[in-house]
């Protein structure tokens, strides 16, 4: 049987992103998200 191995050939980088809550609503403080592969997730 053939052996299959997942290897995308590139690394998926992640980065912490911080936003101000008042930019999207009336709350104060900071919202911290994570960008993985170009997509921001909670």
């Amino acid at each position: 049987d053939a052996e299959f191995r997942h290897d995308s050939g590139y690394e998926v980088h992640h980065q912490k992103l911080v936003f101000f809550a008042e930019d999207v609503g009336s709350n104060k403080g900071a919202i911290i998200g994570l960008m993985v592969g170009g997509v921001v997730i909670a």
Epitope: Q15, K16, L17, V18, F19, F20, A21, E22, D23, V24, K28, G29, A30
Partner: nanobody, 124 residues
Framework: EVQLLESGGGLVQPGGSLRLSCAAS????????MGWFRQAPGKGREFVAA????????YYADSVKGRFTISRDNSKNTVYLQMNSLRPEDTATYYC?????????????????WGQGTLVTVSS
């Protein structure tokens, strides 16, 4: 866009304090979140602190939390960075920058306008 001019840098002993100012020209100052970044010799530019458009919200890099305070006066189109308990590793050129609302405040690419920088040297 806004034009930014920093001042207040200089030579200070370890444990000392400095207050940086950033004067902005333009009537749209309070449309921008404002941030401070720094760049040590031979290193990349790193985020230090940011303040929201209203001045109500702030955010700090872990390396300066509890020692630095960012604030703004929208009536004077000015943002400040009060730096206390300074350390030799705080030595850098400090840059003021402006970011549009809704962009990530802790990354360099969000900032559309930059000042020329002011040099802070912490040494005995």
């Amino acid at each position: 866009e806004v034009q930014l001019l920093e001042s207040g840098g200089g030579l200070v002993q370890p444990g000392g304090s400095l207050r940086l100012s950033c004067a902005a020209s333009g009537r749209t100052f309070n449309n921008y979140n404002m941030g401070w970044f720094r760049q040590a010799p031979g290193k990349g530019r790193e985020f230090v602190a940011a303040v929201s458009r209203s001045g109500v919200s702030t955010y700090y890099a872990d390396s300066v939390k509890g020692r630095f305070t960012i604030s703004r006066d929208n009536s004077k189109n000015t943002v400040y960075l009060q730096m206390n308990s300074l350390r030799p590793e705080d030595t850098a050129t400090y840059y003021c920058a402006a970011a549009y609302r809704g962009t990530a405040i802790n990354v360099r690419r969000s900032y559309s306008s930059w000042g020329q920088g002011t040099l802070v040297t912490v040494s005995s």
